[in-house]
């Protein structure tokens, strides 16, 4: 999978007045990285292992960064036109991408009450625009206001993709988010399921990084994939993952099925608890 | 309009230790980070630390981690630095400062110059 | 700790004359550098944040630049009241450090 930084900011409006402050979140590979706390105006990393990709710096950059473009998003749902009364809200999700032939990505996109309504592609500075008319009219009164405001011009587009893939090679430069493998914790459990029926549910916890293997075998043979249920890997929080493999087996059999787990080199097997 | 009151001086005896106060008003006390900076004689500034007043986060330099223990009392809009142990080489002027932005301080008291001695 | 190395130690101007500090940091603190003066007897005033970034209510004499490891702070025209110490202080690592300070005097 290719190294990701992935910016996430939020402004609201009540009325048609634009609130004070702003919503950030940033994600390092697909991990909450960053968020900005509104109450004490810093950039706080997410977790011990965000604390250690910048070591002994104070998160200065991370905050101004964040301050401006939340500044700037207010600007932008400042010159949307229909607002109506009540809540609604503004987002901005920009992401850059380091991929393993080194080759970059970058792209921003903007939605208004939850809804999509302009991407662009940062390298050839490509928009593009859903089909539907209030996307359409949406999308038209945010890049006319981006095209007046000089510092929107071509070399600010340059500029957001040059930063975002600046800030992700310092922060892949630690070497935390590179070297680190933090091996899963795996637990089995067993829930009763219907008469004669168990469940049987194996969970991998706090590893990273995200790639891992998780199966049920019967007799040393891994079950086929209908008969098993997989959950998603999901960020945990503390820049880890877990995930989920369960299985519906007869019960008596238990000592026939082993849960199989593989990660980084690695793997396992996981007898059901009798 | 901000300010930050400190007392002018106090005088310590060496290992009795000492708290410092700077009693904010003008602005809203649970906002804004407060830095306290040491400044012996004739030399320049060390920053000792900072303390959120909403909820008591710190951050000190590590210099100063058995030396000074910050503390808020958001009733009174009341910073505290309290100076364990302290020796001669304890003797400076210290100062509470407000921050504007982050780690820029915009404010400043007018300094408390503490005498340790006998 | 990242150690900033002001100079000269002492400059002795005449009032009107334009001046400039130096401000050297250890390693490359981006532009988080902040300017500060104070003068006898008094608490330190924030003069310049973020190396140029200006202050409300600091005379537009004074003015930042610089960036990585080398920073400046010039007056374009001296004054009497601009007698003072001058410091720099980085924010982007800890702990927060100042420099030893520059004295202005005139001549």
């Known amino acids: 999978e290719p190294h990701s930084l992935r910016y996430n900011l939020t402004v609201l409006s009540w009325d048609g007045s634009v609130q004070s402050g702003f919503l950030a979140e940033v994600h390092l590979d697909g991990q909450p990285f960053l968020r900005y706390d509104r109450q004490k105006c810093r950039a706080k990393p997410q977790g011990q292992w965000a604390e250690d990709v910048l070591g002994n710096k104070t998160w200065d950059r991370e905050t101004r960064d964040l301050t401006g473009n939340g500044k700037d998003l207010r600007m932008t749902l400042a010159h949307i036109k229909d607002q109506k009364e009540g809540l609604h809200s503004l987002q901005e999700i920009r992401v850059c991408e380091i991929h393993e032939d080194n080759s970059t990505r970058s792209s921003q996109h903007f939605y208004y009450d939850g809804e999509l309504f302009l991407s662009q592609n940062l390298e050839t500075e490509e928009w593009t625009v859903p089909q539907s008319s209030r996307a359409q009219t949406l999308a038209m009164n945010v890049r006319n206001f981006l095209k007046e405001d000089a510092m929107k011009t071509k070399t600010h587009y340059h500029a957001m993709h040059a930063d975002c893939l600046q800030e992700l090679r310092r922060y892949l430069e630690s070497g935390v988010v590179l070297r680190r493998t933090v091996p899963p914790m795996v637990n089995v459990t067993r829930s009763e399921a219907s008469e004669g029926n168990i469940t049987v549910t194996c969970r991998a916890s706090s590893f990273y990084p995200r790639n891992i293997i998780l199966t049920w075998r019967q007799d040393g043979v891994s079950l086929s994939h209908d008969t098993q249920q997989w959950g998603d890997v999901l960020p945990d929080g503390n820049g880890t993952y877990q995930t989920w493999v369960a299985t519906r087996i007869c019960r008596g059999e238990e000592q026939r099925f082993t849960c199989y787990m593989e990660h980084s080199g690695n793997h396992s097997t996981h007898p059901v608890p009798s | 309009q901000v300010q930050l009151q400190q007392p002018g001086a106090e005088l310590v005896r060496p290992g009795a230790s000492v708290k410092l106060s700077c009693k904010a008003s003008?602005?809203?006390?649970?906002?804004?980070?407060m830095n306290w900076m040491k400044q012996r004689p004739g030399q320049g500034l060390e920053w000792i630390g900072m303390?959120?007043?909403?909820?008591?986060?710190?951050r000190l330099n590590q210099k100063f981690k058995d030396k000074a223990t910050l503390t808020v009392d958001k009733s009174s809009s009341t910073a505290y630095m309290q100076l364990n142990s302290p020796t001669s080489e304890d003797s400076a002027v210290y100062y509470c400062?407000?921050?504007?932005?982050?780690?820029?301080?915009?404010?400043w008291g007018q300094g408390t110059s503490v005498t340790v001695s006998s | 700790d990242i150690l900033l190395t002001q100079s000269p130690a002492i400059l002795s101007v005449s009032p009107g004359a334009r001046v400039s500090f130096s401000c050297r940091a250890s390693?490359?603190?981006?532009?988080?550098i902040h300017w500060y003066q104070q003068r006898t007897n008094g608490s330190p005033r924030l003069l310049i944040k973020?190396?140029?970034e200006s202050i409300s209510g600091i005379p537009s004499r004074f003015s930042g630049s610089g960036s990585g490891t080398d920073f400046t702070l010039s007056i374009n025209s001296v004054e009497s009241e601009d007698i003072a110490d001058y410091y720099c202080?980085?924010?982007?690592?800890?702990?927060?450090?100042f420099g030893a300070g520059t004295k202005l005097e005139l001549k």
């Open positions: 973020y190396a140029s």
């Open positions: 202080q980085q924010s982007n690592y800890w702990p927060l450090t």
């Open positions: 400062a407000r921050e504007m932005g982050p780690y820029t301080l915009d404010y």
């Open positions: 303390i959120h007043p909403s909820d008591s986060e710190t």
């Open positions: 390693q490359n603190i981006d532009t988080s």
């Open positions: 003008g602005y809203s006390f649970t906002s804004y980070w």
